[in-house]
């Protein structure tokens, strides 16, 4: 029996009936046995065939067979009902091994030529089943030269038989309050040849509530307790189960915190699984009561461990825990069913006394000492010598604990002392230097401090005043000694004041003229005004059109008087504005250098002399009355003059403070 | 964490302003809660000054309500004691702390030591 | 309100249980913290609203009372609880007890 070639030979060629293509004899036997590499099949098909044709080959035949099996016995030259002649059908092995026998009997009634077959071996698509027949693998299967391989969708890993896939299906933990688990590919089969594990796994205080929800399928047996696949639930308390079958399992209350649950399944069976449906409880905390004025949020029919709520107090009313403020406060449950923290109060805001208002008064509106949510207060200030700055005064106890006015301002209102008031009453007449009376010159300031020199206040707690006057202590302000509230310039009787900062200004060069000769003195401590100290008036804008030459203006002081010493009771004289180039000229002869009045500087003074400031009187405050206002207004500052006060044909030269209002404002602003 | 650190002198004579500063570092003074001062007299009594709360408001012990002032920086969160006309009687360690009645953890500063002296 | 805290020391032994108490002037309900100080150190926050832990404390220290009369339970005392302990009011303003120290018999 000839044998065909074997592999790893290459694996294909040509088989004939002897004699082909003549005709081939009687009782002829042949038999060719081919063989192919493992993974791979025979391929045969015939170009040529012409056998004697009898009932079912008995005959003359050519039969196929693979291992045990007969693929096919053929005969002819054309198929019948009962005979097959194989035209141009192709024939495969069924393993690697193929085996081809030829007969021929005793006789044969006419010649036949017999057969011409072509093989060739390749490979087996093991990938390929026949319907109805099992699938090679159980997810993806791989073919190849050869050879198949299997594999596995994700969350599966391909089991020793290299065929199955078993579910990757252990590790996982639940640790939510409440979820759901199920079998893999739940409601599809579950997957073969599995071990799965869950644990639910919650805080200690929770009870584990498990229920089988929608439908339960796992392999059973009518005799034995699940044999095949099986469900188990295991506590540190006790083991539920093994579960198989098509009923639900009961709902089982775990007692426990920790729950794992395991799943078997065996090589066979297709069946859907099971999905629990997970829950917990715990012992509940007592139900909240909202203090009065609060309320609890999120409401609930109860609270358990974990769980937990807020309060909220009304419009007006705050969180305290006895004295101490709260912005917020959420109390948790506890594993033991009591709150972590104990209620709050929501106690109506209360802003508390209001803050006193220097140089003014607070009324309470609401009621006598009402200082709660929604109460009202009124300040004031202290009537003829201060004036409420900005707002109304009229504040509420707002719901952020605050007192607070119409406009939204959380600081108090400012008691700003009114400027410009005097006792004196002017006529139009110059006359001699006069005494001062009480209340004329309020703003009045003796500053002493090497020398004698005059100031006047402003606001309550700065002085204006000559830069040459104060030079000498601008490193050393603590060293002047700050008077007034007095008439006598050696009256024991008066109000202190000391300076904090002397601002002389940086266009004034000392020895060197008398330009921007003008300086400001910070009190350390306001001053309380009253009718003996009231600050004088900043010129407004439209101040020049009091001020125009001719227009009288009054200078005070404690300085030389005719009789060549200081005097001992504040003087003052009312004196007309000269005309600026007339006052230029009159200094521009010696022995005065030319461009001695700048026109930072106003003159004032009469042409035949004898009404003048002097020394001592220097920094003093000319004012002038605006009659719009009816207030004082400083104009000039006493700053320089002829050596010879009061002389004929020269005139007191002042610092003309409107020049200077922006320097003044800066400087009280940043200071 | 919560941290809370006084600062100021050692050393203030009598008659004059003693001013501590408490620098708060892991959380914001204006998010919740009371901000105090507390001291201790040698001998360990302790005494409440007064709290500046998260939103500014201020509670002061009544015995020292005339001379002290609690205020804040909330951009450098911090806050501050004022206490005015200090006489020996005020020698102590002074605290910052952060009390909440059980609500969040209370935390305290190391304290500083401040002596009234001249 | 004031604060009493009548013993000034505390004689104990390790493994001893021991109250220590602090009563009130006038009602402050609940409203009672207590610290506990070591020599050089800040006092440490053991007990809130009468009764409450803080976390991290451990629980053989137990506050208990309300109104007017508090108590700081130490169950089986140990060798690092040997400090002075002060109760605190803040019902109405703030005001601590005067410390109780405890000490090694």
């Known amino acids: 029996t000839p044998l065909g070639p074997k592999w790893p030979e290459p694996v294909f060629g040509r088989l004939a009936s002897p004699g082909f293509p003549g005709e081939y004899a009687n009782d002829q036997e042949r038999r060719w046995t081919l063989t192919a590499p493992p993974g791979y099949r025979l391929r045969l098909y015939f170009t040529h065939f012409d056998l004697e044709l009898s009932h079912l080959c008995e005959y003359d035949f050519v039969k196929l067979s693979s291992g045990a099996k007969v693929l096919a016995t053929l005969c002819g030259q054309e198929s019948t009902d009962t005979e097959r002649a194989p035209g141009k059908d192709t024939f495969y092995s069924l393993g690697s091994s193929l085996d081809i026998t030829f007969r021929s009997d005793y006789s044969n009634e006419k010649p036949f030529t017999g057969f011409e077959a072509f093989y060739a071996a390749e490979d087996i698509d093991e990938c390929q089943v026949a319907p109805g027949e099992a699938p090679t693998c159980d997810h993806h299967c791989h073919n190849h030269l050869g050879g198949f391989y299997c594999s596995c969708r994700a969350g599966y890993v391909l089991h020793r038989n290299k065929r199955t896939c078993s579910a990757l299906c252990s590790g996982q933990v639940f640790t939510q309050r409440s979820g759901e688990l199920s079998s893999p590919e739940y409601p599809r089969p579950y997957p073969k040849l599995s071990s799965c594990t869950y644990s639910i796994s919650l805080e200690e205080g929770f009870s584990v509530i498990l229920d089988f929800v929608e439908s339960f399928d796992v392999e059973t047996h009518p005799e034995t307790l699940c044999p095949y696949d099986f469900l188990k639930i295991q506590t540190d308390r006790e083991e539920h189960g093994p579960f198989c079958g098509k009923t639900l399992p009961h709902r089982i209350e775990t007692k426990s915190n920790t729950v794992t649950i395991t799943f078997v399944t065996d090589e066979s069976g297709d069946h859907t699984g099971w999905k629990i449906h997970y829950t917990s409880t715990a012992q509940p905390c007592p139900y909240p009561m909202a203090p009065p004025n609060g309320h609890v949020s999120p409401v609930q029919a109860k609270y358990i461990l974990k769980d937990s709520f807020s309060i909220f107090c009304e419009t007006g009313y705050e969180l305290l825990q006895g004295h101490l403020p709260l912005k917020s406060f959420t109390a948790v449950c506890q594993k033991d069913g009591s709150w972590d923290r104990p209620m709050p109060a929501c106690s109506i805001v209360d802003c508390g006394p209001p803050d006193d208002l220097p140089s003014g008064r607070v009324e309470y509106i609401t009621g006598p000492g009402v200082t709660t949510y929604k109460a009202v207060i009124q300040y004031s200030c202290e009537e003829t010598f201060y004036t409420m700055k900005v707002n109304d005064g009229k504040y509420v106890c707002e719901a952020d604990g605050f007192w607070t006015s119409s406009k939204g301002e959380k600081s108090l209102p400012v008691c700003e002392p009114v400027c410009g008031l005097s006792a004196r009453t002017t006529g139009g007449r110059i006359y001699g230097g006069q005494k001062a009376k009480p209340g004329d010159f309020p703003w009045q300031v003796l500053i002493l401090g090497g020398t004698t020199a005059a100031g006047a206040l402003l606001y309550d707690n700065w002085v204006l005043t000559a830069a040459h006057a104060v030079y000498e202590q601008k490193h050393d302000a603590s060293a002047l000694d700050i008077r007034m509230g007095t008439l006598k310039r050696l009256s024991p009787h008066y109000t202190q004041a000391w300076s904090e900062a002397v601002f002389i200004h940086e266009g004034y060069t000392h020895d060197a003229g008398f330009d921007n000769d003008i300086a400001l003195i910070k009190l350390n401590n306001k001053v309380v005004i009253n009718s003996n100290i009231t600050p004088i008036c900043l010129p407004r804008k439209e101040a020049e059109s009091f001020m125009r030459t001719d227009d009288i203006g009054t200078a005070s002081g404690w300085g030389l008087t005719q009789r060549g010493f200081l005097a001992r009771n504040l003087m003052y004289v009312d004196i007309p504005i000269v005309d600026h180039q007339k006052c230029t000229a009159a200094y521009e002869k010696p022995p005065y250098p030319r461009g001695s009045v700048t026109a930072n500087m106003l003159c004032a003074g009469l042409e035949s002399g004898g009404k003048d400031s002097c020394r001592g009187d220097s920094g003093g405050a000319l004012v002038f009355l605006d009659s719009e206002t009816e207030r004082w207004f400083v104009g000039g500052i006493v700053s320089w003059g002829s050596m010879n006060c009061g002389e004929a044909g020269q005139y007191g030269v002042y610092t003309k403070v409107i020049n200077y209002i922006p320097w003044i404002e800066n400087i009280i602003s940043d200071f | 964490d919560v941290q809370l650190q006084e600062s100021g002198p050692g050393l203030v004579k009598p008659s004059q302003s003693l001013s501590l500063t408490c620098t708060v570092t892991?959380?914001?003074?204006?998010?919740?809660?009371?901000w105090n001062w507390i001291r201790q007299f040698p001998g360990n009594k302790l005494e409440w000054m007064g709290y500046?709360?998260?939103?500014?408001?201020?509670s002061y012990n009544p015995s020292l309500k005339s001379r002290i002032s609690i205020t804040r920086d909330t951009s450098k969160n911090q806050f501050f004691l004022q206490l005015n006309s200090v006489t020996t009687e005020d020698t102590a360690t002074y605290y910052c702390?952060?009390?909440?009645?059980?609500?969040?953890?209370?935390?305290w500063g190391q304290g500083t030591s401040v002596t009234v002296s001249s | 309100i004031v604060m009493t805290q009548s013993q000034k020391f505390m004689s104990t032994s390790v493994g001893d249980r021991v109250s220590v108490t602090c009563k009130a002037s006038?009602?402050?309900?609940?409203?009672v913290a207590w610290y506990q100080q070591k020599p050089g150190q800040s006092p440490k926050a053991l007990i809130y609203?009468?009764?409450y832990r803080y976390s991290g404390v451990p629980d053989r220290f137990t506050g208990s009372g309300s109104g007017t009369d508090f108590t700081l339970t130490i169950s089986n005392v140990q060798s690092e609880d040997l400090a002075e302990y002060f109760c605190?009011?803040?019902?109405?303003?703030?005001?601590f007890g005067s410390g109780t120290k405890l000490e090694l018999k």
């Open positions: 605190l009011q803040y019902n109405s303003y703030l005001t």
């Open positions: 609203s009468a009764s």
């Open positions: 702390a952060k009390l909440g009645g059980g609500h969040g953890m209370d935390y």
């Open positions: 892991g959380y914001s003074i204006t998010s919740d809660y009371a």
């Open positions: 500046i709360s998260y939103s500014g408001r201020t």
């Open positions: 006038q009602n402050v309900d609940t409203n």
